[in-house]
């Protein structure tokens, strides 16, 4: 189990410290009132190119 | 066989302390968030409080939070809630519950309930 | 704060009989609705979670539906030892749950 502070989530999921654990951001899109939503907000879940013309 | 044993309850003196226990035996503690609930004589049933299973997140209901404190010891396989400054109407049934095991999203098991009576 | 609103408070109903049970919330919470059954004395017991999924060693004559703001507990067939009181719980906002004032369901 990974503890706060150490290597971060893997793409497109993010701590819960209520759950103590990596949670999926898609979850998010149902349920945004938990704690781990936060954190998914500030990365993008997953990568994007800008593409110009 | 999971159970869970809750102690502690009693008669209290308005603005007086108890401290409850929930044993917990048959499963793994440590990996599960638990919470307390109670339950007023004759009426429904009452989040009080919940803490992740490290116990380094807590949350509480605004009827207890500054008076009541929820804790717990994962070597000990025990969940605690210390309550102070006790008033009348925290007279009650106070169970202690597991939340699953993926979210929690449900409470599968539950203690019997210990009894607190708030009363002069 | 979402608020859980369950429809009857109370019922009469006999053995064998098919027993309806309302749940609103306050607002949309989704599938997040579990369902508990509670007798004199005793602890609350989880049946239905998730809206529609039976909890392990749940008889199947219990069952449960409905999504957004309205849900139904349905008993297929009222056995004796069914008369209890039901509550609804929403964990849409978990960890900060409520429940419904329940449903108390007695023998006619």
């Known amino acids: 189990e990974q503890a706060p502070g150490t290597a971060p989530c893997s793409r497109g999921s993010s701590w819960s410290a209520d759950l103590d654990k990596c949670m999926d951001c898609a979850s998010c899109r149902a349920r945004p009132h938990s704690d781990f939503c936060l954190g998914c907000a500030a990365a993008p879940p997953a990568p994007f190119r800008l593409l110009w013309p | 066989e999971v159970q869970l044993l809750e102690s502690g309850g009693g008669l209290v003196q308005p603005g007086g302390s108890l401290r409850l226990s929930c044993a917990a035996s048959?499963?793994?503690?440590?990996?599960?968030?638990m919470i307390w609930v109670r339950q007023a004589p004759g009426k429904g049933l009452e989040w009080v409080s919940y803490?992740?299973?490290?116990?380094?997140?807590?949350h509480y209901a605004d009827s207890v939070k500054g008076r009541f404190t929820i804790s717990r010891d994962n070597s000990k396989n025990t969940l605690y809630l210390q309550m102070n400054s006790l008033r009348a109407e925290d007279t009650a049934v106070y169970y202690c519950?597991?939340?699953?095991?993926?979210?929690?999203?449900?409470?599968?098991?539950w203690g019997q309930g210990t009894l607190v009576t708030v009363s002069s | 704060d979402i608020q859980m609103t369950q429809s009857p408070s109370s019922l009469s109903a006999s053995v064998g009989d098919r027993v309806t049970i309302t749940c609103r919330a306050s607002?949309?919470?989704?599938?997040?609705l579990n369902w508990y059954q509670q007798k004199p004395g005793k602890a609350p017991k989880l049946l239905i979670y998730?809206?529609?999924s039976l909890q392990s060693g749940v008889p199947s004559r219990f069952s449960g539906s409905g999504s957004g703001t309205d849900f139904t507990l349905t008993i297929s067939s009222l056995q004796p030892e069914d008369f209890a009181t039901y509550y609804c719980?929403?964990?849409?906002?978990?960890?900060?749950?409520?429940f419904g004032q329940g449903t108390k369901v007695e023998i006619k």
């Open positions: 519950a597991r939340g699953g095991d993926t979210y929690f999203d449900y409470f599968d098991y």
């Open positions: 048959g499963f793994t503690f440590s990996p599960y968030p």
């Open positions: 803490i992740s299973p490290s116990g380094g997140s807590t």
């Open positions: 607002q949309s919470i989704s599938g997040y």
């Open positions: 998730q809206a529609s």
């Open positions: 719980q929403q964990s849409y906002t978990s960890p900060f749950i409520t």
